[in-house]
Interface confidence: low
């Protein structure tokens, strides 16, 4: 709800390059970058290679023209370059930039992959699409480290073992582990390649787990998180074709044995839903354990609306399905094609997530924002970002999403979204969130036996009503304007009945008070009112509810000439509820005890008159 769709920062890439197929927010030495995968781009650094794809870096600050430049990975220009004893590389159509991931630390490195990279050493027999990944230094300067996790000397068969593994179609980076999905291994049973950077060894997935599960595509999506314990890292792999319905597996990374051990699995619900084709590990409820979101973008009630299942971690890797999210359930939306953790977008102490539906609105695309809370996830989305509203040129907006880094320096993490069919990427900046604390002070009860006020003609029963407001928030202005409406007896009004009390202001009577306040950061401002009780009130039983509804008045944003001008703040979202505060009082019952039990006895007599 606090992303600003009015001021998107738009980066445009080369035409027909799929620029935006993958996106990644990155920072180094306090420079903010949006990194963009363009897997069908030509590379200026490898002009003789046919459309190998490229990764572009787009500087956020001091880049008024929104220019993006290709990263030089220093990979040479020629087909057939040696990459091992029985390895020759073919980079034509390798799809560099199909996936991007960042090591989660200050000087974090970047993982960029090309899952269609091929070993042509045995091309007379087989061309082997091993897939290739590259670890780019944090400063984005060449030279990085090459990973070809599926290459093994003297192995030349195509489907067997890892010959056609296509590693890197998905990638994830932890502080110590590089996780690469390899869905083509063992005749497309798939596997997960996990490199431990501390000792430079690969953790091995027990082949028996996967050998007899051909065409399940394990590794099509990967992530990692704290599933079994807050201090251990476990690896997650999606297998969207497993038994036709799709499955997701969590593996414990066992350092001692150097293997991945399965600790959890869950299945999709519908054939062909592609459950497990997108994954997101995020601690939604702040208990120190990762929860899991699993996308099924082709889940269909009518056609491919898509669905995301949310699993809450109950400890020791025991995950429990909380609910399924569907966004707006739009026709052919592919909701769940991408899922990204956004860190704490609105500064409420809980992480938030974005879910892409890139085919919604006839391929314009949309992104939905959901919020974590103590119970897991808030089922109602707080915001829908529509691609066609942000910019009518966008196509497949939401295919890729990256978040969690404050790109503009206002203390809130921002969100970057790729729209590869229009070769576009959009950075959406988060607005500061203001929390308004509202109190309505009322008497415990209203005395209706001894009127305390006068309406100019005769005495009337009345009560004092005081409203107090203050606000706080991170990086918010020192002063705000607040519009509010104080309504009396709202429960009656909501039922279309006449209210039993009314306000008296400067001799005028009114059912509600409308005011504009100037509030100062963390300082309480109060207003005092008198409300009169109508004569001959019949309902003296039900409570009288007062409601103060409020909104921000126009806010001066400051220097517009700045490249990234400050954004106006927003009020904290109330999880879909009205932004208002209520309090209630009752009419005095004049009973000795509050528990006013009737002690009535009824005696009846039947009188019959003869006709």
């Amino acid at each position: 709800y606090n992303l600003d769709p009015q001021r998107p920062v738009h980066f445009q890439g080369p035409a027909d390059s799929f620029f935006g197929y993958a996106v990644l927010e990155h920072f180094h030495d306090n420079t903010r970058w949006v990194l963009v995968g363009a897997p069908k781009a030509d590379s200026k650094y490898s002009p003789s290679v046919k459309s190998p794809g490229a990764v572009f870096k787009c500087r956020v600050h001091t880049n008024p023209d929104r220019r993006c430049t290709e990263l030089d990975m220093a990979r040479g220009k020629n087909r057939g370059t040696s990459c091992g004893k029985t390895c020759r590389e073919d980079r034509d159509d390798e799809w560099m930039g199909v996936s991007l991931a960042r090591q989660p630390k200050a000087d974090g490195r970047v993982l960029a992959c090309a899952h269609r990279w091929k070993n042509i050493y045995y091309e007379a027999d087989h061309i082997l699409p091993h897939g290739f990944c590259y670890i780019i230094p944090s400063n984005l300067q060449a030279k990085g480290r090459t990973l070809i996790p599926c290459y093994e000397e003297y192995k030349k068969k195509y489907g067997e073992e890892h010959g056609s593994c296509q590693a890197g179609i998905a990638g994830f980076f932890t502080e110590e582990l590089v996780v690469m999905g390899a869905p083509g291994s063992f005749y497309w049973a798939g596997t997960i390649k996990v490199l431990n950077l501390t000792d430079n060894t690969y953790l091995k997935l027990n082949d028996e787990v996967i050998m007899n599960r051909r065409y399940t595509y394990l590794g099509y999506a990967v992530t990692a998180g704290h599933f079994s314990h807050p201090s251990t890292i476990d690896v997650v792999g999606g297998a969207p074709q497993d038994k036709g319905i799709g499955k997701v597996y969590i593996f414990r990374a066992d350092r001692r044995s150097g293997t991945l051990i399965k600790i959890f699995q869950a299945s999709g619900k519908k054939m062909g839903s592609y459950f497990g084709s997108s994954l997101c590990a995020v601690d939604l409820n702040g208990d120190g354990l990762s929860d899991l979101l699993v996308g099924a973008p082709m889940f269909s009630e009518i056609r491919d609306e898509g669905q995301v299942t949310v699993y809450i971690n109950r400890g020791n890797g025991a995950l429990e399905e909380q609910l399924a999210l569907t966004g707006d359930g739009a026709y052919n939306a592919h909701f769940g094609e991408s899922i990204a953790s956004l860190d704490d977008l609105d500064n409420d102490g809980f992480p938030d997530v974005a879910i892409g539906a890139p085919k919604e609105d006839d391929f314009a695309g949309a992104v939905y924002i959901y919020h974590g809370d103590a119970g897991g996830i808030v089922p109602q989305y707080s915001m829908k970002l529509s691609g066609q509203k942000i910019n009518p040129v966008l196509r497949m907006f939401g295919q890729s999403i990256s978040g969690g880094i404050d790109m503009d320096g206002n203390g809130y993490p921002d969100v970057t979204v790729g729209a590869f069919m229009s070769d576009s990427v959009v950075l959406l900046r988060a607005r500061p969130v203001i929390t308004v604390d509202v109190s309505i002070f009322l008497p415990g009860s209203i005395n209706i036996t001894a009127p305390q006020c006068h309406d100019g003609q005769q005495p009337v029963n009345c009560l004092n009503v005081t409203t107090c407001f203050s606000f706080h928030g991170k990086h918010v202005p020192g002063e705000i304007g607040l519009n509010y409406v104080l309504m009396a007896d709202v429960a009656k009004k909501e039922k279309g009945q006449m209210p039993r009390v009314y306000f008296v202001l400067l001799g005028e009577t009114m059912g509600q008070v409308t005011e504009k306040l100037q509030l100062t950061y963390m300082e309480e401002t109060c207003r005092h009112y008198v409300a009169h009780v109508k004569r001959r009130v019949q309902d003296v039983i039900s409570p009288i509810v007062f409601e103060a509804a409020y909104s921000l008045s126009e806010h001066v944003t400051g220097e517009e000439e700045r490249e990234l001008p400050p954004l106006t703040p927003v009020l904290r979202w109330k999880k879909g509820q009205k932004i208002a505060q209520k309090n209630q009082t009752v009419f005095e019952r004049n009973c000795r005890s509050e528990d006013c039990a009737a002690d009535l006895q009824l005696q009846g007599k039947l009188l019959l008159s003869s006709m």
Partner: antibody
């Protein structure tokens, strides 16, 4: 955005002095005004800040009894009063404003007021 | 409070050469992926002028020969190439934690 400070002040030890900072070109009540001290040949030292909207102030510890910050919203002017002056208080005093928010940087400065304490 | 130590205290550089000024913080000034370190230039008789904000971002109107780098506790201001007009005192400043503090100047 402009911050216009008062001219040079020559005062005797033990006396008080009031410095002014007239703000223009923006909404005065929306930004805190900060004060910074620079002793002769020395570096910069942050003194404190005032919220022009509410008058709320924050100080560095050793200025809590030395300085008083006030504002006059009608004239969009901030004031700093320094009391019990000694030669240690001889310095250039600047008022400054952040770019935006409460975690940004000093984008706007006054020209400075020179205070000389001498008998 | 966070203490900022600048080095060297003074620096002589030939025109056209590179000048490098260091600023070390007694504790990290990083927060939420941002680095709350800023650089100012001050010429005699003038107030300080903002050069770099958030460690590496060039203030509008400042020549591109000025650049900032660093994170956590170690920061650098670089002027390359140096021009005669760059003769001044340079200060680093943090506002990650109250109170705001400045380096001693170079």
């Amino acid at each position: 955005v402009k911050l216009q400070e008062s001219g040079t002040k020559l005062v005797k030890p033990g006396a008080s002095v009031r410095l002014s900072c007239k703000a223009s070109g923006y909404t005065f009540t929306s930004y805190w005004i900060h004060w910074v001290k620079q002793s002769p040949g020395q570096g910069l030292e942050w003194i404190g800040e005032i919220n022009p909207s509410s008058g709320r102030t924050n100080f560095i510890e050793n200025f809590e009894t030395k300085a008083t910050l006030t504002v006059d919203r009608s004239s969009t002017t901030a004031y700093m009063q320094l009391t019990s002056l000694t030669s240690e208080d001889s310095a250039v005093y600047y008022c400054a404003r952040l770019a935006y928010g409460n975690y940004s940087w000093f984008a706007y400065w006054g020209q400075g007021t020179t205070v000389t304490v001498s008998s | 409070q966070i203490v900022l130590t600048q080095s060297p205290a003074s620096l002589a550089v030939s025109l056209g050469q590179r000048a490098t000024i260091s600023c070390r913080a007694s504790e990290t000034v990083d927060s939420y992926g941002n680095t709350f370190m800023h650089w100012y230039q001050q010429k005699p008789g003038q107030p300080p002028k903002l050069l770099i904000y958030l460690a590496s971002n060039l203030e509008s109107g400042v020549p591109v020969r000025f650049s900032g780098s660093g994170s956590r506790t170690d920061f650098t201001l670089t002027i390359d190439p140096v021009e005669a007009d760059d003769a001044a005192t340079y200060y680093c400043q943090q506002n990650n934690e109250d109170p705001y503090t400045f380096g001693g100047g170079t």
